[in-house]
């Protein structure tokens, strides 16, 4: 910790500006008023402080706000956010989406750090649920965010938020997560017409039950093989050859390429050879 030393004459900082980059660590500690720093946090980012100098500025804010920083300061932390520990962040009460965006911007292009994960957790818990605007923001910064949540956490996602989800946001979700998200998506998109509905629901279908797949097969949807391969095996197995043919449309051609992989392999083994022959693809049960 930096020793408490008096500020040399004429060095007291009247404002936060570039002249401070020439201050030694102890001078920053002694000559920068913490309250001034808090009100002029937005200026800090424009000044090329060293990491050591930033440590001093953080220390001053910690002393001023031992119970956690107010949102007015948090919103303007900028690169100082990278100096925060998860323990620091747990003291915060972040309610503004603008604050969240500002801090995520600082970490943009990097993996989700423990600090960011804590910040998001605090923000979502503060809101009570993962609303559409929040989800929009989070998936824009971290496309894999949704799939990093547990099924329990996903259960707090309201169906209205599903509109913010893009197909790539679900790329790394496992079946347990899709089991939670699919019913919400079905509810969210229930008033759309057939083809539009399928476009929206397609990336959630890894959580669909057999009955819903059977219903889709009656709607000329032409499901591609990549989507079919992500369906639950237990949901695919009861489908008849005719239902799979209707579900896939011209994509039925791809079953041959996937005949050794699940769920296609298991489904083929459940079918009568005479039924498989109706596809004309040379599939052998």
């Amino acid at each position: 910790e930096v020793e408490k030393t008096a500020c040399p004459s004429g060095k007291k900082a009247p404002e936060i500006d570039e002249s401070l980059i020439f201050y030694k660590k102890w001078e920053l500690e002694a000559c920068v008023d913490a309250a001034l720093l808090a009100t002029q946090m937005d200026r800090v980012n424009a000044i090329p402080f060293t990491y050591e100098q930033l440590d001093v500025l953080k220390h001053k804010l910690d002393e001023l706000y031992p119970q956690g920083y107010p949102e007015s300061v948090i919103q303007h932390l900028g690169y100082l956010f990278l100096k925060m520990s998860p323990e620091d962040i747990r003291k915060w009460n972040v309610t503004s989406l603008e604050t969240l965006k500002a801090l995520l911007e600082v970490n943009k292009g990097h993996e989700m750090s423990p600090q960011v994960a804590t910040l998001i957790d605090r923000f979502v818990k503060g809101r009570g649920q993962l609303d559409k605007d929040t989800l929009d923001t989070l998936t824009a910064f971290y496309p894999g965010y949704l799939c990093s949540l547990s099924p329990e956490e996903l259960s707090s996602v309201p169906p209205s938020s599903i509109w913010a989800v893009r197909p790539q946001d679900l790329d790394t979700c496992d079946p347990r997560q899709l089991d939670v998200l699919y019913p919400k998506a079905r509810l969210a998109f229930q008033n759309m017409n057939g083809s539009e509905y399928f476009v929206k629901i397609q990336s959630f279908l890894g959580g669909a039950p057999t009955e819903d797949l059977k219903a889709l097969s009656q709607q000329n949807v032409s499901m591609d093989l990549a989507t079919f391969m992500k369906l639950r095996t237990d949901a695919v197995l009861p489908l008849t050859v005719a239902e799979v043919q209707k579900l896939l449309g011209p994509h039925v051609e791809g079953l041959k390429a996937e005949e050794r992989h699940r769920p296609v392999r298991d489904w083929i083994l459940r079918q009568r050879q005479d039924d498989l022959d109706t596809l004309g693809l040379g599939l052998q049960g």
């Epitope: 591609d224 011209p250 051609e253 791809g254 390429a257 005479d274 022959d277 004309g280």
Partner: antibody, heavy 114, light 107 residues
Framework: QVQLQQPGTELVKPGASVRLSCRAS????????MHWVKQRPGQGLEWLGN????????NYNEKFRNRATLAVDKSSTTAYLQLTSLTSEDSAVYFC???????WGQGTTLTVSS | DIQMTQSPASLSASVGETVTITCRAS??????LAWYQQKQGKSPQLLVY???TLAEGVSSRFSGSGSGTQFSLKINSLQPEDFGTYYC?????????FGGGTKLEIR
Amino acid sequence: QVQLQQPGTELVKPGASVRLSCRASGYSFSSYWMHWVKQRPGQGLEWLGNINPTTGDINYNEKFRNRATLAVDKSSTTAYLQLTSLTSEDSAVYFCVRHDGFLWGQGTTLTVSS
Amino acid sequence: DIQMTQSPASLSASVGETVTITCRASENIYSYLAWYQQKQGKSPQLLVYYAKTLAEGVSSRFSGSGSGTQFSLKINSLQPEDFGTYYCQHQFGTPRTFGGGTKLEIR
């Protein structure tokens, strides 16, 4: 062995009809669609249509729909292509092809000439 | 109907060279594309299916790539037996149109 056998040549007169055959052996005939492809001398490949031996479903290239008829005889594992109202434009090699593209017949050279 | 446009129509190359033939579909055909080689007076032979899967017994000098509407067949280190005409064909529904062909000749 696995093969598709086609007669080498057919010579017919303009205005007549012809039935080309393709006998499959060595694999489950019912398990694959059978396709027919036309190739005029020095030209590219042209898809005529396909038939599913199990269901009898048939798809035609619109260009040939009125003059081509596809059929199969499962008992002899043979596919047929019938062409009617022949003209010199129909002089070509006709191939039968198993659905996966792995297996082609040797082709029948059809000559339409008076 | 889906149109298949192949280029170039003809190509001269020397033994040992690498050549690439392209095929464009008029609409999205995903990966449902096959490539064939045909020698004079013979039946076509399957080289590649599902855009990039090499058919059994085909030399690894051949490779297919692409998806959607743009596809290509690459032949590395050309050998005398590689000369002939190459065709692409879509496998996405019917009618199963072929490209116009690319005649590969010895320079």
